[in-house]
Amino acid sequence: MSAKSRTIGIIGAPFSKGQPRGGVEEGPTVLRKAGLLEKLKEQECDVKDYGDLPFADIPNDSPFQIVKNPRSVGKASEQLAGKVAEVKKNGRISLVLGGDHSLAIGSISGHARVHPDLGVIWVDAHTDINTPLTTTSGNLHGQPVSFLLKELKGKIPDVPGFSWVTPCISAKDIVYIGLRDVDPGEHYILKTLGIKYFSMTEVDRLGIGKVMEETLSYLLGRKKRPIHLSFDVDGLDPSFTPATGTPVVGGLTYREGLYITEEIYKTGLLSGLDIMEVNPSLGKTPEEVTRTVNTAVAITLACFGLAREGNHKPIDYLNPPK
Amino acid sequence: MSAKSRTIGIIGAPFSKGQPRGGVEEGPTVLRKAGLLEKLKEQECDVKDYGDLPFADIPNDSPFQIVKNPRSVGKASEQLAGKVAEVKKNGRISLVLGGDHSLAIGSISGHARVHPDLGVIWVDAHTDINTPLTTTSGNLHGQPVSFLLKELKGKIPDVPGFSWVTPCISAKDIVYIGLRDVDPGEHYILKTLGIKYFSMTEVDRLGIGKVMEETLSYLLGRKKRPIHLSFDVDGLDPSFTPATGTPVVGGLTYREGLYITEEIYKTGLLSGLDIMEVNPSLGKTPEEVTRTVNTAVAITLACFGLAREGNHKPIDYLNPPK
Amino acid sequence: MSAKSRTIGIIGAPFSKGQPRGGVEEGPTVLRKAGLLEKLKEQECDVKDYGDLPFADIPNDSPFQIVKNPRSVGKASEQLAGKVAEVKKNGRISLVLGGDHSLAIGSISGHARVHPDLGVIWVDAHTDINTPLTTTSGNLHGQPVSFLLKELKGKIPDVPGFSWVTPCISAKDIVYIGLRDVDPGEHYILKTLGIKYFSMTEVDRLGIGKVMEETLSYLLGRKKRPIHLSFDVDGLDPSFTPATGTPVVGGLTYREGLYITEEIYKTGLLSGLDIMEVNPSLGKTPEEVTRTVNTAVAITLACFGLAREGNHKPIDYLNPPK
């Protein structure tokens, strides 16, 4: 694999207003405290830390219809988009540490500014494809994909804070893995737009090996292109990542999470990564928090080359230099 | 299956000096206390108990370079080799209850004295293939395979206590299953020697059914031969075998462990078995200890014919004799 | 899928005398309390509640040989058979909430009165195929299949309470999934009669996708016919359904349980369903009880169309009517 696959720009995105639970803004902090950067460097990654984005508080951010905190969410993603684009222009893989999943609007938009041909793999229990009109919760972390899809352009009203957004991916450019809690409106969109998805049903039917084979063939079969992996830790089973906002039983195993990310690494095409929705406030015990964080760290390390079969540098270990 | 597949010689190997944690020498005791012998007899096995080997304390066993307790480890395996060879000459399947995995040097060496054409299946989170020169820990339970492989003959220095060892298997005679924590030097050896392995990545990709099909075809496809299964309980996920010295998350499930052993039994070729690294002192609670021990017992019973689909003797259960 | 697949008649069967543990008679109550009916209605099911069957106490119900409570068990199943037949004549899918698995004698008998060509999928850790003569426990919840099979007609003695029973299915009409604790006599019957089964060994070998493909092809390949799913919650791993009478480690996962039921729903042929052996008295903690009940509810909802990929009604969610 080229060194490019291990050249990273880390962006902390301590933001929580796309959903109602406090604590997810601490995600970047706990991931850093768990030694993420040190571990990446240990596995021969070239890591540049772009720090945590300073998200200013926006007063009077009243709802748009039932959509909550629209200006805060829109502005946060706008900031993030700029920073991700900067990282990409610097030739690094962007690693966004969330924060809630509404930030994917910014992360993918920024990525697409530099690599408009990117393909997205979205690992999540949820499709996050509600529009501001189909949402029943009003939480924007359940809506990012609707803002990003060209096919939904006419279906997104003018939400304050989002005027900067231009849809940048087509329905054929995204693959979902791990779905198991999908709203009726979201399901309608999924089927109507013919989006490729592997819900937990397909994962059970095919096995994760075939799922990844089909995913990568679907996105890369015709032409190699940059991959953006947006990983919500709730895609994994709550037994592995309990400290998250919307856990759903019956998720991907720790092993399946690692397999997905190992396979993506092996393409050599990973170009942007989001690690989202770690919320240390939602662990019932300190152990639940560390379990969640350690799992998120392991997933990240696999994205950047750590392999369960082992790794070695190109030297002769049996005849070390005198 | 012939009665030979259920004719067993049990050897307790209460030894712990291949690693730093006290308690693994109690492995044979807790496995016996859990009723292992009684359960084997209940499933129609012909069990001969050769007792626990008496490992004398060796004073002044100073390190060789960084390799710890070399004389103790070497002597223990030498004793075990003799006892395993005796069991094999008696026409029994050797069942070694460890004790730490350094003992596999003795178990496989003794087995190979009587069956030099044996093939090895090594179930473990680790390759245990460090040489005394590549090891960073100095613990010999991480090195047994390096002593056994003919291809590494020139790479093993003269470690005190090991002058009796003659490498007895080729790189093509071993298959690993369950790997997920492999040192760089070990990975180098794995790839350089072209050793067949199924890390957890391959298990996830292929499923355990295909893994076992490929394993048995690889070892037995050209010619039937005796199988030595060396089973480190850390090959299984720590949720099933927590009371062990080097647990690694993301391991084989209880079900996968049973599948591996059921399939090996069904070949009719199991000739030697090691059940290693049960350490009752490392259970956080007594329940963790019994969970580990019960799992190890279940794995062992499957090696000797206990099947999840059920078993019956060759009698008519619907028309029992009057 | 036609509306028929979501037209349900619910029968509570609060009965426990097919086994020794009190509490399983509370199964219908806890399943109802968990909101099962409301949830079914929420997913567009047409639900008719036939209430709980009133099982009168039968005095002097002395054992037949070692078979316990024969008159009580026989009478309960006789009552249930009548009620299931009524539900089927009303054009509804019968949903029996157990209660212990001896009730399947009644549930399947009643179903077969109206649909004599039915095929049975039996999800269970156990075959429940002991005859009154092969049983060692005497508990009738381990015997229902022996009463139902035509091939065993001559092997079933005249047990008081069962004179009404006529075997209604052939050995070729049933498929087992999840087996892992099978008595020798039961195994003999399984093999002698050539019954199709997927023990946990086969599930591990093939994966649940292939298991369901083969199951449905076996039962429906030549001719479409009604399916009766008899689901013992002990078929699932005790980590998901601990509050049950005879838990056995190494069971089907929550995901596999959902996959089985989703696939059965998708045939459009589900005609009868039993949800059996939920015993709230056997949860070690309140959480164990709710975990069991929630799992049983999820399994049931999947039988009637709830899909992990999502569901939507045939309306346009993006252009809702003004």
């Epitope: - | 009723g35 009684e38 007594p286 200890v289 | -």
Partner: antibody, heavy 116, light 107 residues
């Protein structure tokens, strides 16, 4: 021969707590697990819980969680059980017993009487 | 919890008789069943482990059998010192549980 010597009989008032001991000798204390068993009015036996003297890890019968607390003092090879919020239902003989699967060695028992 | 049911509750015999005591488990427990004897004002003592395995120091007239759910303790030619309570205990799962006991008394 393994010896498990238990503390003497106790009479306490309802609502009080009591701590009984079990001193082990003639074997390595940390090598075996110590269980506690309750016997009410000379008949039924109930397993309370078990402790690992090696690391203090415990597994309890859910029924006795909150009622019994098991501890050990490695230095004196002694196991302890504390029972709290005592009622007449807790009046019984309590045995310390070793090991993990079957119980080969039993203490002589401590009689607890709870009475006002 | 696994329930162990012992029968009969009381057994009256004459020295020299042979007797069988039953212990039935509420679910299959393989051979994870052990038998104890308790004489009046004494602690229980282990007689049989794993359904049928004898314990050193225990007279050979005591034997055990069974597997799964049904277990039997047999005493071949009862002696006067054998009178007392007999308990079975399972080690198949937590919590460990005992049967209610069978009282062996002189007829």
């Amino acid at each position: 021969e393994v010896q498990l010597q238990q503390s003497g009989p106790v009479l306490v008032k309802p609502g009080a707590s009591v701590k009984m001991s079990c001193k082990a000798s003639e074997y390595t204390f940390t090598d075996y697990y110590m269980n506690w068993v309750k016997q009410s009015h000379g008949r039924s036996l109930e397993w309370i819980g078990v402790i690992s003297p090696y690391n203090g890890g415990t597994t309890y019968n859910q029924k006795f969680k909150g009622k019994a607390t098991l501890t050990v003092d490695k230095s004196s090879s002694t196991a302890y059980m504390e029972l709290n919020s005592l009622t007449s239902e807790d009046s019984a003989v309590y045995y310390c017993v070793y090991d993990l699967y079957y119980f080969d060695y039993w203490g002589q028992g401590t009689t607890l009487t709870v009475s006002s | 919890n696994i329930v162990l049911t012992q029968s009969p509750a009381t057994l009256s015999v004459t020295p020299g008789d042979s007797v069988s005591l039953s212990c039935r488990a509420s679910q299959r427990i393989s051979n994870d069943l052990h038998w104890y004897q308790q004489k009046s004002h004494e602690s229980p003592r282990l007689l049989i482990k794993y359904a049928s395995q004898s314990i050193s120091g225990i007279p050979s007239r005591f034997s055990g059998s069974g597997s799964g759910t049904d277990f039997t303790l047999s005493i071949n030619s009862v002696e006067t010192e054998d009178f007392g309570m007999y308990f079975c205990q399972q080690s198949n799962s937590w919590p460990r549980t005992f049967g209610g006991g069978t009282k062996l008394e002189i007829k």
